[in-house]
């Protein structure tokens, strides 16, 4: 169950990070 929660949180963070990049034009972290 914890793995699933971690995966879900990771997905949300990924979406938020992509949105941040699209909004700001900053370069993605390598």
């Amino acid at each position: 169950r914890k793995n699933l929660q971690d995966f879900a949180a990771c997905g949300i963070d990924r979406m938020n990070y992509d949105s941040y990049l699209a909004q700001t034009g900053k370069s993605p972290a390598k």
Epitope: D18, Q23, T24, G25
Partner: antibody
Amino acid sequence: QSVEESGGRLVTPGTPLTLTCTVSGFSLSRYAMSWVRQAPGKGLDWIGYIDIGGGAYYASWAKGRFTISETSTTVYLKVNSPTTEDTATYFCARGVANSDIWGPGTLVTVSS
Amino acid sequence: ALVMTQTPSPVSAAVGGTVTINCQSSQSVFNNKWLSWYQQKPGQPPKLLIYFVSTLASGVPSRFKGSGSGTQFTLTISGVQCDDAATYYCQGSDYSSGWYSPFGGGTEVVVE
């Protein structure tokens, strides 16, 4: 939250022209801004953008032909040496992708 | 460089029917999901419909659906309404020392 372009007019070939994009309701310190153009009856051409650090980036075809800059509430697009092929409506839009706020556009006509 | 290709255009649809618009990228878009769809009506700026392949923009009706991954993407309009008559554009993005976000050539949807 809105953006509005201005400065479009009739110019002769080779005469530099600067377009203005005025933003309200959000900060350029948090959002990049893109420029897109559309020739009459044609599709959308992505020109480039300016990021939140003030760095300007261009499509390969647009390099040298355009210059993007900004102040605290305004973004500029300079058409360095217009040709008749630059006749188009020019839009500014919020973000480098997923652009959710667009201005109505400003028409540039290049003719001798 | 990233090139976006749309097919077909124009496409006809009956009121209440379904329309499918395809968009192909010359290489994978960033993170396999930096793909947006816009609707544009004559005399108006583009309106964001869908971003990150399948996420519906705020206020967009659920009859619009985006799908796909990698280099092949689709916009599906179900229960087509007269108001859906417009030109639709995909926009892909990739990063290489700067973002590059070109548009497809556009697909006109005619509602009969």
